[in-house]
Interface confidence: medium
């Protein structure tokens, strides 16, 4: 069953020209979901074996980190990875993480996109694809934005698209990125992509957004069947998380009620994820999704910040990229107030929507996303939403 996703009311985003690309977003008071509820088990997670294959399991190489692969696997057969829970304590996951280029036989580079004042939302996905419109703009700091994207320099050119057959649209954060779906202050000038059409259903044809100058060299239409147009008469948000409910084969069964303390779920159920994402509510088979942030060890110091990348305390020189000053922290750690701290610790909300932050050896920060009940989350930081409806 094709699932649909969006990042919390973000269906597509508009880049406004003339704005410094690396200032914190203005007028955005939204707060990220807090860390996992107290009492949740953050023990190590053993992934089932098996090769990564198919569109959902694409391993992508970050164009910004030369020669170093990063992982975004929906149902990863991590084999054995040394992971660290949010506290930074090492947790062993058996076996060895395969490098993406070994799995795919090639490195996958996201294509460049010409600068555009507006990035229209991607069209409806074809069955089997998952659409990941524009990740939610990180709220914590430019540092986190920079670390998350893994770029050695900010790219003000606009959205970055990951390799097409993953179908993930990941725009570079900019201070004035706003939701096309969110019309406040636009006075009718904003244009949104109404992606409410259920995947696989025929799209309508009226009011197509103007995408001239925005389509990359490989056409978006190669990825998806059609554009589902924005409904000009609907000036309220048109976010696919809210728009439609995914189809399921069986009627909903009773799910367990929240227990005292309001824990999200018994995390023990999450320790061995299944290979089938987006199970309907009440199936009793919640799954998790892991997403690695691009490695940070080649990033150097952070522009406009006193935080630099350094080795973890007590482990000088370990996992250092070649540098003259040796001031870099290990992957997934950043220098903060003179010491290397895990991004998981530094940013308690690093993984959105209740995702759990882990550190994976030689990979960096890793988010394990909740995939239960009516919605589940994916993306490098669990920022994207997929409904089980």
């Amino acid at each position: 069953v094709p699932a649909r996703e969006a990042g919390s009311a973000v269906e597509a985003e508009e880049l406004v020209k003339g704005s410094p690309a690396w200032e914190p977003p203005a007028n955005d008071t939204r707060e990220e979901a807090g860390p996992p509820a107290a009492g949740e088990d953050e023990a190590s997670w053993t992934a089932p074996g098996g090769e990564l294959a198919g569109p959902e399991e694409v391993l992508q190489e970050s164009a910004a980190v030369t020669g170093t692969a990063w992982l975004e696997a929906d149902s990863p057969g991590l084999g054995g990875v040394t992971a660290e829970a949010g506290s930074g304590d090492a947790q062993a996951l058996p076996a060895t993480l395969q490098a993406p280029h070994e799995v795919l036989g090639q490195s996958i580079m996201p294509p460049a996109i010409p600068e555009a004042t507006e990035a229209s939302g991607p069209p409806s996905p074809t069955p089997g694809d998952k659409l990941s419109p524009a990740s939610e703009l990180p709220k914590e700091s430019p540092l986190e934005v920079w670390l998350n994207l893994g770029g050695s320099t900010p790219d003000p050119q606009g959205p970055e698209l990951t390799y097409p057959f993953q179908g993930t649209l990941e725009p570079q954060p900019a201070s004035d990125i706003i939701d096309i779906d969110y019309f406040e202050g636009l006075d009718g000038e904003g244009r949104g992509a109404d992606l409410g059409s259920f995947p696989g259903s025929p799209g309508t044809s009226e009011n197509h957004p103007d995408t001239e100058g925005e389509t990359p060299s490989w056409s978006l239409l190669d990825l998806y069947d059609d554009f589902t147009p924005f409904d000009e008469s609907d000036f309220y948000p048109t976010t696919s998380f809210y728009d439609d409910l995914d189809e399921e084969e069986e009627e909903e069964e009773d799910d367990k009620d929240a227990v005292g303390g309001g824990d999200l779920e018994d995390e023990n159920e999450l320790l061995v994820p299944t290979g089938k994402p987006g199970l309907g509510p009440g199936t009793g088979q919640p799954t998790s999704r892991w997403h690695a942030v691009p490695p940070q060890h080649t990033l150097g110091s952070v522009p406009g910040s006193s935080i630099a990348l350094r080795p973890r305390p007590g482990e000088p020189g370990r996992d250092l990229a070649s540098s003259e000053n040796g001031t870099e922290c290990r992957s997934g750690f950043v220098r903060h107030n003179g010491s290397c701290r895990s991004v998981c610790d530094l940013f308690p909300s690093y993984c959105h929507n209740g995702g759990q932050c882990y550190l994976v050896e030689n990979i960096g920060a890793f988010c394990r996303c909740n995939t239960q009940d009516y919605i589940w989350h994916k993306g490098m930081r669990c920022e994207s939403i997929i409904t089980d409806f």
Epitope: G196, D234, Y236, F241, E248, G262
Partner: antibody, heavy 116, light 111 residues
Framework: EVQLLESGGGLVQPGGSLRLSCAAS????????MSWVRQAPGKGLEWVSA????????YYADSVKGRFTISRDNSKNTLYLQMNSLRAEDTAVYYC?????????WGQGTLVTVSS | QSALTQPASVSGSPGQSITISCTGT?????????VSWYQQYAGKAPKLIIF???KRPSGVSNRFSGSKSGDTASLTISGLQAEDEADYHC???????????FGGGTKLTVL
Amino acid sequence: EVQLLESGGGLVQPGGSLRLSCAASGFTFSSYAMSWVRQAPGKGLEWVSAISGSGGSTYYADSVKGRFTISRDNSKNTLYLQMNSLRAEDTAVYYCAKKWNLFDYWGQGTLVTVSS
Amino acid sequence: QSALTQPASVSGSPGQSITISCTGTSTDVNGYNYVSWYQQYAGKAPKLIIFDVSKRPSGVSNRFSGSKSGDTASLTISGLQAEDEADYHCSSYRRLRLPVLFGGGTKLTVL
């Protein structure tokens, strides 16, 4: 302009049945999940049921599960709520609303009174 | 399926600012950024005024703002006006069985 117009409410005895309809216009009906939300007199809002754009998935609040059935006819741009085994506590204004969680458009509501 | 908790009533004078709270749990308000607020005049249908914790739909006055801290979401109305007198309902996505949870509603009186 998006419009939702409910009908079918009225007075019914406990144990009786009613079928509510919601005629939609101004948007691509089949592209959106639709919901029923009710409001008992002097009370807050209560989500009742939701249905996917194609009608393939339906969800219900526990309080109505097994008694109410949500459906839609996309060719007629109409949403339905079949209510059986009605109880006094089902007395409320029933609203149809666009989408399933973020209700950006609402109908004017139709009053269902369950009383003997 | 207990509702989100809102104060039954709040009042304020014209020009003042008032805040209406909406308290839930980690399975709803605290766990997700999917809190919405609706304004409802007597005898009328609700109207969306805030979504995703703090976003305003087009046409909604910027005197309305939303925020969230932990288990509690808040709606703040600044520069209170007579036409703000209405009922205000919060809602949140909720995990486990019930995807949409509403608050009990808060009656705002402008003195």
